[in-house]
């Protein structure tokens, strides 16, 4: 069991267009038709103004318009919504595709891709209905933009929700050596597939991917829970042969100084083909980017069950550790280090500043505000330490 | 491992809809996977129908698309088919299935279904 | 949609003889260097079972007697020696592009 390991289907809360939880200081815009179109109309359900955003320019052929929402913090954004124009029923503007960005500093924007490469997402096929996206996988943003598409001169208009949880882990990057291919009688492709930082030299380093995505994989690595992947799609795993130091070394950068409790490693650790659990486990801590690693590294080895060949979640304890970067070294102990999920028990170390520069507001883990509730494929449920939207029979 | 149950009506009446239910039991169906509902012909052709992808998003047989609509119900982890305006050619027995990316792992026992006036 | 033409239609194998049926897909099923190819067997009153997955894998629990082999649109399963439990149907299936479809499956008998 992942202690700390958050659930992405319970990670799937408005984050607060519809209920105005987001003030309209935090919705912007590339540009605006007019003041009664202008960003902070893009509220899903909403009725004011005229009853959306809507664009000064065409998004056709260049799609260059964005409607951006700012969360403040960072959150797992697990789900949008979008709907056309209202305008008391006469709206007639809508957009059938939209890509989306997003970044955590304001700086690095990302473009959001599904598991297969695809960045365009379909869209709305009339102005009122509420069509919702799953983002598989979701993405860890402050801020998110839309860039609504056309496939002709038109216009069009958009209002939105974000659906998600705050992005407890405070996880904003992790460096890793690519991922590798293990040959059996089919290719196992042990990428990170979903990271959305650099790739240089062989190194993965400024974003997150597969590791922090809250997927855990089965006990076979060349299985998927997920559907039309290829073998080997939620592990990230080396091969010792390309290791002559005989262990991989990852780095972790987190938002703000924390003491770290803990870091849970799911491994895998099927062993008729190779995958061993790590032999053990070496972390050292700074504070910040330019500084010397403080004090002596953090060494643990592993015990239990070896020969079980089940997957399962290593604890790595971290001693309360005080450190805002941490670079762990994971000892082979078999041909093969497979890990489908990192992640990291902790808590903020009081009065230190977040790291992406401003101090945030205060935001709760599970945002208060409700979901769209006037189509039928949304599910409600009571509030408490339960989700409060889930996506049901959306279309893709 | 995964259980599956498939519950609901024995016999339709043409041109009505018929609905079946799903019951998953020892997995969520918001952890993972694709939650699929098949059919198998009285002269034992398979059809795929559809499913709900573990994150809610659904896919339908293109022959199918016009008729077909697959739910969930999360609290009770459960699965739902409905197939409106059955004909004769509709009977059959109908399976929920799940499936990751190596096919359709786990099977329920299967609920035939007659569609007669 | 992918067409899946399973032959023979019917086989009939000695015991502790070799069973071998066939698949041919009206396009390849291969992506990421796999193939999207499952074979299950089916016994009458019961649910289809998972054999053998991505064309050569062979499912957990299932005996090693069982093997399958092809890429892109042809594929095989195998079974041996055979054994009388072997008696049933055969599909194959590919989840390489939607709609997942099945062949009209190869009946196995014992001579």
């Known amino acids: 069991d992942m202690k700390g390991h958050f659930d992405p289907a319970k990670c799937r809360y408005a984050l607060g267009m519809q209920d105005r939880t987001i003030p309209d200081s935090d919705i912007s815009a590339s540009s605006s038709w007019s003041d009664s179109t202008a960003a902070r109309h893009s509220r899903l359900e909403s009725s004011d103004g005229d009853g959306a955003w809507c664009p000064a320019g065409s998004v056709f052929p260049k799609e260059e318009e964005y409607l951006q929402v700012d969360l403040q913090r960072l959150h797992l954004v697990a789900l949008v919504g979008t709907q056309g124009r209202h305008a008391g029923g006469l709206g007639k503007e809508f957009s059938r595709s939209y890509r989306l960005r997003y970044s955590r500093d304001g700086r690095r924007w990302m473009g959001w891709k599904d598991r297969w490469g695809q960045e365009v997402i379909s869209g709305n096929e009339d102005p009122e209905g509420v069509v919702l996206k799953d983002l598989g996988p979701p993405m860890v943003a402050r801020l998110v933009r839309f860039y609504p598409r056309a496939d002709r001169v038109m216009s069009v208009c958009l209002r939105v929700e974000l659906y998600g949880c705050l992005w407890r882990d405070g996880l904003l990057s992790y460096t890793a050596p690519v991922g590798q291919t293990m040959y059996l009688s089919e290719a196992v492709y042990l990428n990170d597939s979903t990271y959305d930082g650099h790739t240089v030299g062989g190194l993965q380093y400024g974003g997150l991917g597969q590791l922090a995505d809250g997927v855990v994989g089965l006990d076979d690595f060349r299985k998927s829970q997920e559907l039309r992947v290829w073998p080997g799609y939620d592990y990230v795993g080396w091969s010792n042969h390309s290791f002559s130091s005989g262990y991989v070394e990852m780095e972790f950068e987190f938002d703000r100084l924390r003491a770290f409790q803990a870091m849970q490693v799911h491994c895998n650790n099927m062993h008729t083909l190779g995958a061993r659990l790590p032999g053990g486990v070496e972390c050292r801590f700074r504070r910040g980017p330019a500084m010397a690693w403080e004090g002596e590294p953090m060494r643990h080895n592993l015990g239990g069950n070896l020969g079980d060949p089940r997957a399962r979640a290593v604890s790595v304890p971290l001693g309360g550790r005080v450190a805002r970067f941490l670079q762990c070294r994971f000892l082979f102990a078999g041909p093969w280090l497979l890990f489908s999920e990192i992640s990291f028990i902790s808590d903020v170390v009081n009065n230190s500043s977040p790291a992406l520069g401003g101090t945030f507001p205060p935001a709760p883990w599970w945002p208060p505000g409700p979901p769209p509730t006037n189509f039928s494929s949304l599910e409600l449920e009571p509030r408490g330490q339960q989700p409060v939207a889930k996506a049901e029979g959306s279309p893709t | 491992d995964v259980h599956l149950q498939e519950s609901g009506p024995d016999l339709v009446k043409p041109s009505q809809s018929l609905s079946l239910t799903c019951t998953v039991t020892?997995?969520?169906?918001?952890?993972?996977?694709?939650w699929h509902w098949i059919r198998q012909f009285p002269g034992n052709k398979l059809e795929w129908m559809g499913y709900i992808h573990y994150g809610g998003s659904t896919k339908y047989n293109s022959s199918l698309k016009s008729r077909i609509s697959i739910t969930r119900d999360t609290s009770k982890n459960q699965f739902f088919l409905q197939l409106k305006s059955v004909t004769t050619d509709d009977t059959g027995t109908y399976y929920c299935?799940?499936?990751?990316?190596?096919?359709?792992?786990?099977w329920g026992q299967g609920t035939l279904v007659t569609v007669s006036a | 949609d992918i067409v899946l033409t399973q032959s023979p239609t019917s086989l009939a194998v000695s015991l502790g003889q070799r069973a071998t049926m066939s698949c041919r897909a009206s396009e390849s099923v291969d992506d990421y260097g796999t193939s999207f190819m499952h074979w299950y067997q089916q016994k009458p009153g019961q649910p289809p079972k998972l054999l053998i997955y991505r064309a050569s894998n062979l499912e957990s629990g299932i005996p090693a007697r069982f093997s399958g082999s092809g890429s892109r649109a042809d594929f095989t399963l195998s079974i041996n020696p055979v054994e009388p439990d072997d008696v049933a149907t055969y599909y194959c299936?590919?989840?390489?592009?939607?709609?997942?479809?099945f062949g009209s499956g190869t009946k196995l008998e014992i001579k």
């Open positions: 299936q590919q989840s390489n592009e939607d709609p997942f479809t």
């Open positions: 020892d997995y969520s169906i918001t952890s993972g996977y694709g």
């Open positions: 299935a799940t499936s990751g990316n190596y096919g359709f792992a786990y």
